[in-house]
């Protein structure tokens, strides 16, 4: 039986300041039950970038249609990129629980920010 895989196909993405960055992530299964979240960095100090149900993330939108059934595309788009957004972003699957438990992470996508073209 195949285990769930979390796939971040790009190791790195380079975006000009002021543009939008698309960070791709797909899962190979809808189970185990539980959400996908995006983080920048690893460890206890990592920054939550996107959680569909909790928090307010005005610059982040899911790429896929939010009403799409049985969606396994968890890619996000971050608008108005600045140099402060540089870092490695991880797509992380959680198992539903109280609290949710981290199950599997993608390999990460490093975002680098180029100077805005003059």
């Amino acid at each position: 039986e195949e285990e769930l895989q979390v796939i971040q196909p790009e190791k790195s993405v380079s975006v000009a300041a002021g543009e939008s960055a698309t960070l791709n992530c797909t899962a190979t299964s809808l189970i185990p039950v539980g959400p996908i979240q995006w983080f920048r960095g690893v460890g206890p100090g990592r920054e939550l970038i996107y959680h569909q149900k909790e928090g307010h993330f005005p610059r982040v939108t899911p790429v896929s249609d939010p009403t799409k059934r049985n969606n396994m595309d968890f890619s996000i788009r971050i608008s108005n990129i600045t140099p402060a957004d540089a870092g490695t972003y991880y797509c992380v699957k959680f198992r539903k629980g109280s609290p949710d438990v981290e199950l599997k992470s993608g390999a990460g996508t490093e975002l680098s920010v180029r100077a805005k073209p003059s």
């Epitope: 039986e1 809808l30 185990p32 149900k53 939010p66 009403t67 799409k68 049985n70 539903k96």
Partner: antibody
Framework: EVQLVESGGGVVQPGGSLRLSCAAS????????MSWVRQAPGKGLEWVST??????YYADSVKGRFTISRDNSKNTLYLQMNSLRAEDTAVYYC???????????????WGQGTLVTVSS | EIVLTQSPATLSVSPGERVTFSCRAS??????IAWYQQKPGQAPRLLIY???SRDTGIPDRFSGSGSGTDFTLTISSLQSEDFGVYYC??????????FGGGTKVEIK
Amino acid sequence: EVQLVESGGGVVQPGGSLRLSCAASGFSFSIYAMSWVRQAPGKGLEWVSTIGADDTYYADSVKGRFTISRDNSKNTLYLQMNSLRAEDTAVYYCAKDSTVGWSGDFFDYWGQGTLVTVSS
Amino acid sequence: EIVLTQSPATLSVSPGERVTFSCRASQNVRSDIAWYQQKPGQAPRLLIYAASSRDTGIPDRFSGSGSGTDFTLTISSLQSEDFGVYYCQQYYDWPPFTFGGGTKVEIK
């Protein structure tokens, strides 16, 4: 075409056991969560249990007495019911979970149900 | 546990009439509401998910609306085959998934 066919219902005495089965076809069974929902005679719908991969969830009313499991090689969902009580009398439906967005499950296909009667 | 309250419990309606069902949640469930139709002796059938998205093959006379705590299912012109019981379900916070008590639609 998605099909869910339940079996295993019947009459059992209080304290007894039954094992329900749900044979699934027409979809990739192994990647979807599956659930059991019951309906007592003349009453509304009550969620019983859900299984993802090896992750399982139960209503408080059945926790410790019922066990949900699945065999992906046989495309079959099970519900082992022990220590049955009169209040467990119901039609038990097998349901395929569907997600929308990034989380949140509802039930997009249902079997026709199997009746479990707990009576002495 | 999130409690869903459906009203009215019973509706007596004539074919061709517009019908509105209410489902109220005890706390905010965003748009994580589904609606089901159940006819006597049959399994429930999914009509609406995500509060307002019609399932495949559901006629456009069925529509859903609402967010937060108040939700509505509307049948714009009731057909004879629409009689039965209608249930709402929340999937915002579970376990447990919870269903409303149902609204029965009967012929006037």
